[in-house]
Interface confidence: medium
Amino acid sequence: SAPGEDEECGRVRDFVAKLANNTHQHVFDDLRGSVSLSWVGDSTGVILVLTTFHVPLVIMTFGQSKLYRSEDYGKNFKDITDLINNTFIRTEFGMAIGPENSGKVVLTAEVSGGSRGGRIFRSSDFAKNFVQTDLPFHPLTQMMYSPQNSDYLLALSTENGLWVSKNFGGKWEEIHKAVCLAKWGSDNTIFFTTYANGSCKADLGALELWRTSDLGKSFKTIGVKIYSFGLGGRFLFASVMADKDTTRRIHVSTDQGDTWSMAQLPSVGQEQFYSILAANDDMVFMHVDEPGDTGFGTIFTSDDRGIVYSKSLDRHLYTTTGGETDFTNVTSLRGVYITSVLSEDNSIQTMITFDQGGRWTHLRKPENSECDATAKNKNECSLHIHASYSISQKLNVPMAPLSEPNAVGIVIAHGSVGDAISVMVPDVYISDDGGYSWTKMLEGPHYYTILDSGGIIVAIEHSSRPINVIKFSTDEGQCWQTYTFTRDPIYFTGLASEPGARSMNISIWGFTESFLTSQWVSYTIDFKDILERNCEEKDYTIWLAHSTDPEDYEDGCILGYKEQFLRLRKSSVCQNGRDYVVTKQPSICLCSLEDFLCDFGYYRPENDSKCVEQPELKGHDLEFCLYGREEHLTTNGYRKIPGDKCQGGVNPVREVKDLKKKCTSNFLSPEKQNSKSN
């Protein structure tokens, strides 16, 4: 039977009355246009909604925007457009919300053609009040907050100037000209690239990488011949042009650019690209594009210094620079990532890793599903997940996969069951164990969201027709109840819930359309009365993550340790609550070969845990560049996986000798790097 129709599905008692009392409608006094929504702060209940309406006239576009504020999670909204002097706000810059709970908001206004600079509206009290500030420049990008200090802002101007404010946008100073890209690093450091000869595009591959650690008082050139740069975890990456040809290589620094090492990754040509797929303080997933317009490349995983890389996954789907990849970090379980590969017959298949890229496998076929037309063998196939690429291809996939760190083990995604991703209308699948096993949760495409740290899942059918029904589940998607939230169906445009999945409120956004008018409308439903009591100790059960063989002493060991979680029982209908903290008990595992990646010059044959020497490197000395010196590597082929905490057990030998030879590649060697002060 279909999910939610089993006899054992108990109904939540009196839910219609409970939800009806907690359903709040707000009709916005607006022509339809577009709407954007931002949450201000965490657990504050403050939402800002910006509606914009463009009237294209013959000579120019006349625009009108309205700003609304809610402080009760969207149940009620107040029109606060007068606080921004009824100014038209530029939607392409969005609403720049400050980090953490700073309560800061910056809105960028549309200004008339001849003005000297742009205009912003600033709030530091969760949008209760705004201050208008005229800028001495026209912004090219949204204001970027320093992660460490929300009073520090940076922005690029349309003239390629780098502007900094130290007092939350009150006063601005241009600290450098001819800037292409600027990013905040740690400790209020700014990294940026500059051009010398004309433009960012013309100088691509000849840019300089600069650093300022004092907001523009002094500068240091930390790299030359730069194509681009990126930050990931504690790593600073730069792609650098080779001396002799048009290829470029990745260099990496872990000390803010003072010293650099050449990453042991293939160089790429003009038409290729590198992409940091994911990074944390331990390691990096790097995609290296294949030559030619193939649409795929190779994923490499780094060691703890970001220098030595192991091949992780071949034929990884990634269409073009800035294009589409399905690479997804499953945040509800440590070490799990999902992505797509392009097979030889040009079909697309989903792969999953449970050990941070060490090994990839297909997703297990859901028990309650049959193989579709893509399957050669109707009894053997896998689940394939729709993500960014499917969405870009305009398939009937309204949402990417969803997981939340505090909803342990839960992954929700659209998928198809066969030998490859199908273009047929997908269904929605759920995993409650971080991707090891899957169940069909809903027939056909849906929007979905997680509330109360997994205590409630909410879904709305994806339809071109107006809707008035929402579905919800209190048992991780096994059984579903439907609630009609309005008599008059609306054209649905989106589900909004507070980031972090701790809230019990969901807002359904859409518009009503009558013969003459079209208005934005939101329905906010509070589920607090469905989960009418707080969860107690008896509502939780112990769950061992990554468990595949309970008989095995090492069961659950991933990256050198296992974790037991306290998880809400599916049968318990209670509130985790806003203050819910995931309870986990880690324990260290003995080291096995699974805790080691293959070292530089080694690889793992399929279905083998041993690392063997790459044939082309047999008998060669293994030398690589580290901190600008050539190093000789003595290894029996293994290196500890970054972040792996195992102890004892197997312990392969690994030693690195300094060859005392320079190998700075195209970078200025540290002693020659120049500094200057303003």
Epitope: G295, L317, D345, I348, E370, A373, Y389, G418, V423, V425
Partner: antibody, heavy 129, light 107 residues
Framework: QVQLVQSGAEVKKPGASVKVSCKAS????????MSWVRQAPGQGLEWMGI????????SYAQKFQGRVTMTRDTSTSTVYMELSSLRSEDTAVYYC??????????????????????WGQGTTVTVSS | EIVMTQSPATLSVSPGERATLSCRAS??????LAWYQQKPGQAPRLLIY???TRATGIPARFSGSGSGTEFTLTISSLQSEDFAVYYC?????????FGGGTKVEIK
């Protein structure tokens, strides 16, 4: 086993309409598109259109636009093809065919086509005054 | 629409011989091409999909090749049951279109 069973032969007068049914069994009905193809006596195959059983969206060949309507009933796993304003040149055998059109999402280079892998036995429609 | 042209219209071959059938598209259809066999009084039967992949249960003597605009169906050693009409069909762009067919007859 997987099969498509079509309704019986029809004799119609010019200007009338005909509705041919095609009942699917042995597979999940909603997972495959269905195409309709016709073949006039002694002639080749001519594609008429395609229907997606989920949602019922359709795409018709220009030649039949305005005269053909394809529908489906998911409760009985049946698709229907109705052709109106019949003329003598509509005399033909009409086939439904399961069409896993582009069912494997292909990479950037191209889509991948699986072909019409299961066909109905055909329904003969004769238009004669 | 994409026009599919098959040649020859009729091919006379002796049993055991090799038969080569051609199909040309008026514009590129990539590998989105299928071949069908039809015997008198029967529905068509899928032989090849994706230009070169044999459908389930199709003998190895049938093979398809080509990509873009030029395609070939080869029957390596004709058996008596292979004498029939063969159609190619593209599914690159709607509407799907068939070639006019090639009749393979006994010489």
């Amino acid at each position: 086993q997987v099969q498509l069973v079509q309704s019986g032969a029809e004799v119609k007068k010019p200007g009338a309409s005909v509705k041919v049914s095609c009942k699917a069994s042995g597979y999940t009905f909603t997972k495959y598109y269905m195409s309709w193809v016709r073949q006039a006596p002694g002639q080749g195959l001519e594609w008429m259109g395609i229907i997606n059983p989920i949602g019922g969206s359709t795409s018709y060949a220009q030649k039949f636009q305005g005269r053909v309507t394809m529908t489906r009933d998911t409760s009985t796993s049946t698709v229907y093809m109705e052709l109106s304003s019949l003329r003598s040149e509509d005399t033909a055998v009409y086939y439904c065919a399961r069409d896993p059109f582009g069912i494997a999402l292909a990479g950037p280079a191209s889509r991948y086509y699986y072909g019409m892998d299961v066909w109905g036995q055909g329904t003969t429609v004769t238009v004669s005054s | 629409e994409i026009v599919m042209t098959q040649s020859p219209a009729t091919l006379s071959v002796s049993p055991g011989e090799r038969a080569t059938l051609s199909c040309r598209a008026s514009q590129s259809v990539s590998s989105n091409l299928a071949w069908y066999q039809q015997k008198p009084g029967q529905a068509p039967r899928l032989l090849i999909y994706g230009a070169s992949t044999r459908a389930t249960g199709i003998p190895a003597r049938f093979s398809g090749s080509g990509s873009g605009t030029e395609f070939t169906l080869t029957i390596s050693s004709l058996q008596s049951e292979d004498f029939a009409v063969y159609y190619c069909q593209q599914a690159r762009l709607g509407p799907w279109t068939f070639g006019g067919g090639t009749k393979v007859e006994i010489k």
